[in-house]
């Protein structure tokens, strides 16, 4: 058993039928010694008396808010949550496996630049009685500070018969060094509580591996005289790290016909312009990627040919 | 060329070669994310590689003030990785394919380090750890780890030379 926060405790249980469970001793936070009784949740049934209460915690029915009273007055509370360990593996019932980039991916994170700011998100089908708390650090043995905000519900989607809820959080490394080569990964820890179930999820990554630039901005076409060719130009996204002579991007320019089946023409360039042939009803798209490290491509920025 | 005395390197040549190094490092190990190397054991094997750290002067301001600290750090790293790529880890079983980019990568690391330090000048180099994994699968894992680490190192080096070529070239 360990303390999650004040008066909230997590009991770790090997989870299988007939498991012996864990013996837990609760102590009433009071100088009183006599006349103390204990109850669980809203029930008025007295579970025991005395300054301490010993319970065998086996199932969710044994978890909940234990309260000690004296003469009708509440003295203190202890909320017991359960953390299930099935077959040696901590349960992951609350969050959905996003399966990208690999199985058992519950948290996904992205950064728009090297400033040390990043966003993580996760999915669940649970709509109520759900709380999240997020902590992060650079490295784990001698952790350096990363500050995370509160997790918020960022999207709701309907998936078949189910509703899916997306939560996200923004974090910022306290003393980021954008130009350095990371040697210690960022660790992100999410505590999830649904009713009386506790779970924790972790992700470990280098900022360089989660970089996804915003799409290029100010995408423009300039027709070239007496030619079917156009000059496409664009700019670095505002959110990208500066100076651009140091934090350089590379670009992919694509000409795509109206039909998805039509052949796509692609050009790769380090410049912020390119000359392409603009077909009727086609569109021109440009996306960006770090020039020197193959992290994710940005989403496409597009303009129609006409 | 960068000499210990402090004259400027051939920024544009270094830029071209370091960008080629980035391409080669990624073609040698393109499987990003397919193997989470941090989940595997053997942490000590790649902990000793030289990293370009915050105080090494490789940021734009540091380069403007005095690029020598940064160039020395990059040189150290290049020599370190060049030795690793020439070691038993890469030459032993399982053999690399004949068209593997590792050979080119090895040669380019040497080429860039020589651009930074002509013969007769010596910056101190870091001792390479004695890594001789016994099992072929351990060697394979170590190759992946070294290449992932090299990708991060050469990315920073390439940024340094690109910025130098754009802003510090005579």
């Amino acid at each position: 058993i360990w303390e999650l926060k004040k008066d909230v405790y997590v009991v770790e249980l090997d989870w299988y039928p007939d498991a012996p469970g864990e013996m837990v001793v609760l102590t009433c936070d009071t100088p009183e010694e006599d006349g103390i009784t204990w109850t669980l949740d809203q029930s008025s049934e007295v579970l025991g008396s005395g300054k301490t209460l010993t319970i065998q915690v086996k199932e969710f029915g044994d978890a909940g808010q234990y309260t000690c009273h004296k003469g009708g007055e509440v003295l203190s509370h202890s909320l017991l949550l359960l953390h299930k360990k099935e077959d040696g593996i901590w349960s992951t019932d609350i969050l959905k496996d996003q399966k990208e980039p690999k199985n058992k991916t519950f948290l996904r994170c992205e950064a728009k630049n090297y400033s040390g700011r990043f966003t993580c998100w996760w999915l669940t089908t649970i709509s109520t009685d759900l709380t999240f708390s997020v902590k992060s650090s650079r490295g784990s043995s001698d952790p350096q500070g990363v500050t995370c905000g509160a997790a918020t519900l960022s999207a709701e989607r309907v998936r078949g018969d189910n509703k899916e809820y997306e939560y996200s959080v923004e974090c910022q490394e306290d003393s980021a060094c954008p130009a350095a080569e990371e040697s210690l990964p960022i660790e992100v820890m999410v505590d999830a509580v649904h009713k009386l179930k506790y779970e924790n999820y972790t992700s470990s990554f280098f900022i360089r591996d989660i970089i996804k630039p915003d799409p290029p901005k100010n995408l423009q076409l300039k027709p070239l005289k007496n030619s079917r060719q156009v000059e496409v130009s664009w700019e670095y996204p505002d959110t990208w790290s500066t100076p651009h002579s140091y934090f350089s991007l590379t670009f992919c320019v694509q000409v795509q016909g109206k039909s998805k089946r039509e052949k796509k023409d692609r050009v790769f360039t380090d410049k912020t312009s390119a000359t392409v042939i603009c077909r009727k009803n086609a569109s021109i798209s440009v996306r960006a990627q770090d020039r020197y490290y193959s992290s994710s491509w940005s989403e496409w920025a597009s303009v129609p040919c006409s | 060329r960068a000499v210990p005395g402090g004259s400027s390197p051939a920024w544009t040549q270094c830029q071209q070669l370091s960008q080629k190094l980035c391409t080669l490092a990624w073609s040698a190990h393109p499987l990003v994310g397919h193997m989470d190397l941090r989940e595997e054991g053997d942490e000590e094997t790649t902990n000793d590689v030289p990293h370009i750290q915050c105080g090494d002067g490789c940021d734009p301001q540091g380069l403007r003030d005095n690029s020598q600290f940064c160039l020395q750090r990059i040189h150290q790293g290049l020599i370190f990785y060049e030795k690793l790529l020439g070691s038993d880890i890469f030459t032993g079983e399982p053999s690399l394919l004949p068209d593997s980019p590792v050979g080119q990568l090895h040669a380019s690391l040497l080429g860039l380090s020589q651009l930074l330090q002509p013969e007769g000048h010596h910056w101190e180099t870091q001792q390479i750890p004695s890594l001789s994994p016994s099992q072929p699968w351990q060697r394979l894992l170590l190759r992946f780890k070294i290449l992932r680490s090299l990708q991060a190192f050469v990315a920073v080096a390439a940024r340094v030379f690109a910025h130098g070529a754009a802003t510090l070239s005579p």
């Epitope: 039928p17 077959d87 040696g88 593996i89 | -």
Partner: antibody, heavy 116, light 106 residues
Framework: EVQLLESGGGLVQPGGSLRLSCAAS????????MSWVRQAPGKGLEWVSS????????DYADSVKGRFTISRDNSKNTLYLQMNSLRAEDTAVYYC?????????WGQGTLVTVSS | DIQMTQSPSTLSASVGDRVTITCRAS??????VVWYQQRPGKAPSLLIY???TLESGVPSRFSGSGSGTEFTLTISSLQPDDFATYYC????????FGQGTKVEIK
């Protein structure tokens, strides 16, 4: 005492369907993950499928993926295995067991024979 | 898929013998290994999980060891009840069993 009792086995033709049931008692069924494991006559054990306590997450062996469906009815304390497009190689004793990976409690098994 | 190769496939022994069964995984699987015993005509029963943890109620003559790719089940002094088939199983990724080792009377 934990008890698991399989039923629904029998003889079926190739291409046919069968639904196995496993009635659980002696524990809070809705709290625990469950699995099906099979054993061909005279052969070794093969994991078939698992389902989490809520029924929200399921896993299948490649050999049955797309043909078998695991489900549960927590109100009836029952685990199911719907088997479609049955093949001769699906002939086996099918056991239901507690757990997703470590099978602590097993039923006595039900024999499924696929033959024309 | 991860393959689990058990050896030997049959083992002849006498009461009181020390018996060792080996299981080799096709890749590093840490300690995510389980051992089961199956008597003829019966369902399997759990002996050991996480490579070396003895299930409650299982006699202490059974022990498990190993990590990575090599695992062993040892019966320190074979009893009449122990003549059965033993299976290892990995649960590092998905679930696969070894082909079984039959321990028979010499």
């Amino acid at each position: 005492e934990v008890q698991l009792l399989e039923s629904g086995g029998g003889l079926v033709q190739p291409g046919g369907s069968l639904r196995l049931s496993c009635a659980a008692s002696g524990f809070t069924f809705s709290n625990y993950s469950m699995s099906w494991v099979r054993q061909a006559p005279g052969k070794g054990l093969e994991w078939v499928s698992s389902i989490r306590s809520s029924g929200g997450r399921t896993d299948y062996a490649d050999s049955v993926k797309g043909r078998f469906t695991i489900s549960r009815d927590n109100s009836k304390n029952t685990l199911y295995l719907q088997m479609n497009s049955l093949r001769a190689e699906d002939t086996a004793v099918y056991y239901c067991a507690t757990g997703i990976a470590v099978a602590r409690y097993w039923g006595q098994g039900t024999l499924v024979t696929v033959s024309s | 898929d991860i393959q689990m190769t058990q050896s030997p496939s049959t083992l002849s022994a006498s009461v009181g013998d020390r018996v060792t069964i080996t299981c080799r995984a096709s890749q590093n699987i840490g300690t995510w290994v389980v051992w089961y015993q199956q008597r003829p005509g019966k369902a399997p029963s759990l002996l050991i999980y996480k490579a070396s943890t003895l299930e409650s109620g299982v006699p202490s003559r059974f022990s498990g060891s190993g990590s990575g790719t090599e695992f062993t089940l040892t019966i320190s002094s074979l009893q009449p009840d122990d003549f059965a088939t033993y299976y290892c199983q990995q649960f590092y990724t998905s679930k696969t069993f070894g082909q079984g080792t039959k321990v028979e009377i010499k």
